[in-house]
Interface confidence: low
């Protein structure tokens, strides 16, 4: 049984084996096109969410679509009904909180009076001066909370109280990517992961331990990718993992928050790195232990230097190391979490590409998370 | 100004080990990887491998994976590179050579070169 | 490993002339090539990085060009100084080859 399901994959009506490496190949090889159901699906990058929640408290502010403006929420007859669906509008399924916090001096956009039609919040139509001063603090979830802060030192081993959102996503059995969770369904990570194997039945995703090998395993229902632009091969190094199971949440299992849309980090920024790669450049081994270290944001325009990336960090990249080198994330951490800390642990970025590891001055690449939230919030309402 | 002193000439016999330092002055020693690059005489450059000052971690040529050892001592700002088994086709110049800033950046200083002539 | 291919392997030319070698890489490097220059008894030394940036208090005669496989070196005006052996190098992969190098003499 465990060699037939290891090589073979059983196709229904009528009952026949065919070999397991005709799964996800573009062909519909059983009859009921079985064969290609449970693969690595892309998913368009999709509208604009009408909703976002600012680095300014986790102010909520709602899109007026007929003039692409946006506007703050004020808090006046606020509801958790609207709060639910301004989470519901992203994704989350989880029970909000939220509060007001006073209108700061340097408030730029109009404030308004929100309400809601068909499931979307809108601005009230007669919307007077915001009379309660306040505007709407929302959380969609309790996240980048950690039993544990880290020590400011190079390179160091971790413990899953400090960073309980770290997973390790392994196929057939062996550490292939970090990750992080998201919320109890999903698991971010890099789509590049799945380059090679792109059936999501001997995918795996393991949380709540350190240790490489020791914690039991999660089956992965969905593994979402976003669709290639050739125009920017390295662009779009983003998957999102549904579990079949929500995970329970605990001390050592927890979700990272998202970065906010407005999360802009400037050079030299503190940042922190995670994962279980490997400790040398050409190889060496992959770590049993969890290893974290401090790293820092390395600008865009030094990072596309004709002596470094030559341009090819986009947009939606970001570059973290430290300029004397040395530390640096290496294969196997690829699609872990690059991570910052305010009120709140959040993943700013997904461990994506580089050139050698820990060099001086050669930065990672990594996918910047805050240029994805719209897709990532297409996903979760595709998927509610 | 940045100056990268090598270790003087050295005669050795076949099967024999040798050590040649290089002395790196004028910028910061950990900010740049050193490269070791040799050339047989009347013969082009052959690109040896990479060392990274800072955490001390290598890349070798597979030519040489083996027999080669590139190490380094931050305290004095210097480099080794080790090669073992010498045989009589390892007679060359060998240079270190930094690059510009980067792990892919072109070598911007070289050393003076160091002449090992192995001998039978 | 990514095989450099320079032509020609030699040539003579006057000072005055425009002299132009290309190398040629077995796989495409992006723009990750240099172009060196050496003189008999003395290390190389850089003149061309980036595929076409011009390494600072190197003549403003030298110039790189190219990108994938295909890359060229150009020196508009030949003086008698630059009478040498150059060589290209790829940076895109390791190890980081060299072509064979390129000896230009005097006519």
């Known amino acids: 049984k465990v060699i037939l399901d290891k090589y073979y994959f059983l196709c229904g009506q009528p009952l026949h084996f065919i070999p397991r490496k005709q799964l996800c190949d573009g062909e519909l090889d059983c009859p009921l096109g079985e064969d290609e159901e449970h693969c690595v699906k892309s998913f368009p990058e999709g509208p604009a969410v009408a909703v976002r929640l600012s680095k300014d408290r986790s102010t909520l502010q709602v899109l007026d679509s007929a003039t692409g403006n946006w506007f703050s929420a004020c808090f006046d007859n606020f509801t958790e009904a609207l709060a639910e669906t301004a989470c519901r509008q992203m994704g989350y399924s989880s029970k909000p909180t939220f509060r007001a916090v006073e209108i700061g001096p340097d408030q730029d956009l109009d404030v308004v009076e929100i309400t809601e039609n068909s499931q979307e919040l809108r601005m009230r139509n007669s919307s007077g001066p915001c009379l309660s001063g306040s505007l709407v603090s929302l959380h969609c979830l309790a996240c980048g909370k950690s039993l544990k802060t880290p020590r400011v030192v190079g390179v160091e081993e971790a413990s899953v109280d400090s960073w309980p959102w770290q997973v390790s996503i392994q196929y057939d059995k062996q550490h292939v990517c970090g990750g992080s969770i998201l919320d109890p369904h999903w698991v971010l990570t890099a789509a590049h992961c799945f380059r090679k194997h792109t059936d999501v039945f001997n995918w795996k995703v393991r949380a709540g331990s350190d240790k490489l090998g020791s914690f039991p395993s999660l089956a992965v229902a969905k593994i979402i990718i976003i669709e290639f632009n050739p125009m920017y091969p390295k662009d779009n190094d983003i998957a999102l993992m549904k579990l079949q199971f929500p995970l329970t949440f605990s001390g050592t299992v927890r979700p990272i928050c998202l970065p906010f849309f407005d999360e802009e980090l400037t050079p030299a920024t503190p940042l922190w790195i995670i994962g279980w790669g490997f400790t040398k450049q050409n190889g060496g081994k992959m770590s049993d232990i969890l290893l974290q270290a401090s790293v820092q944001v390395i600008d865009s325009t030094r990072c596309n230097a004709d002596d470094a990336y030559q341009g090819e960090v986009t947009e939606k990249m970001m570059c973290a190391g430290i300029p004397e080198g040395g530390v640096d994330t290496c294969q196997g951490d690829s699609g872990g979490p690059l991570m910052y800390q305010s009120d709140q642990w959040h993943v700013v970025g997904i461990v994506s590409w580089g050139y050698g590891c820990g060099g001086p001055s050669t930065p990672g690449v990594y996918t910047k998370v805050s240029a994805y939230l719209n897709w990532i919030y297409n996903v979760w309402k595709a998927e509610l | 100004q940045v100056q990268l002193v090598q270790s003087g000439a050295e005669v050795k016999k076949s099967g024999a080990s040798v050590k040649v330092s290089c002395k790196a002055s004028?910028?910061?020693?950990?900010?740049?990887?050193m490269h070791w690059v040799r050339q047989a005489p009347g013969q082009g450059l052959e690109w040896m491998g990479v060392?990274?000052?800072?955490?001390?971690?290598?890349s070798y040529a597979q030519k040489f994976q083996g027999r080669v050892t590139m190490t380094r001592e931050t305290s004095t700002s210097t480099v080794y590179m080790e090669l073992s088994s010498l045989r009589s086709e390892d007679t060359a110049v060998y240079y270190c050579?930094?690059?510009?800033?980067?792990?892919?950046?072109?070598?911007?200083?070289w050393g003076q070169g160091t002449l090992v002539t192995v001998s039978s | 490993d990514i095989q450099m291919t320079q032509s020609p392997s030699s040539l003579s030319a006057s000072v005055g002339d425009r002299v132009t070698i290309t190398c040629r890489a077995s796989?495409?490097?992006?723009?990750?090539l240099a172009w060196y220059q050496q003189k008999p008894g003395k290390a190389p030394k850089l003149l061309i990085y980036?595929?076409?940036t011009l390494q600072s208090g190197v003549p403003s005669r030298f110039s790189g060009s190219g990108s994938g496989t295909d890359f060229t070196l150009t020196i508009s005006s030949l003086q008698p100084e630059d009478f040498a052996t150059y060589y290209c190098?790829?940076?895109?992969?390791?190890?980081?080859?060299f072509g064979q190098g390129t000896k230009l003499e005097i006519k």
């Open positions: 060392i990274n000052p800072s955490g001390g971690t290598t």
């Open positions: 050579a930094r690059g510009r800033g980067w792990l892919r950046s072109a070598l911007g200083y």
């Open positions: 796989q495409s490097i992006s723009s990750w």
């Open positions: 190098q790829q940076s895109y992969n390791t190890p980081y080859t």
């Open positions: 980036a595929a076409s």
């Open positions: 004028g910028y910061t020693f950990t900010s740049y990887y």
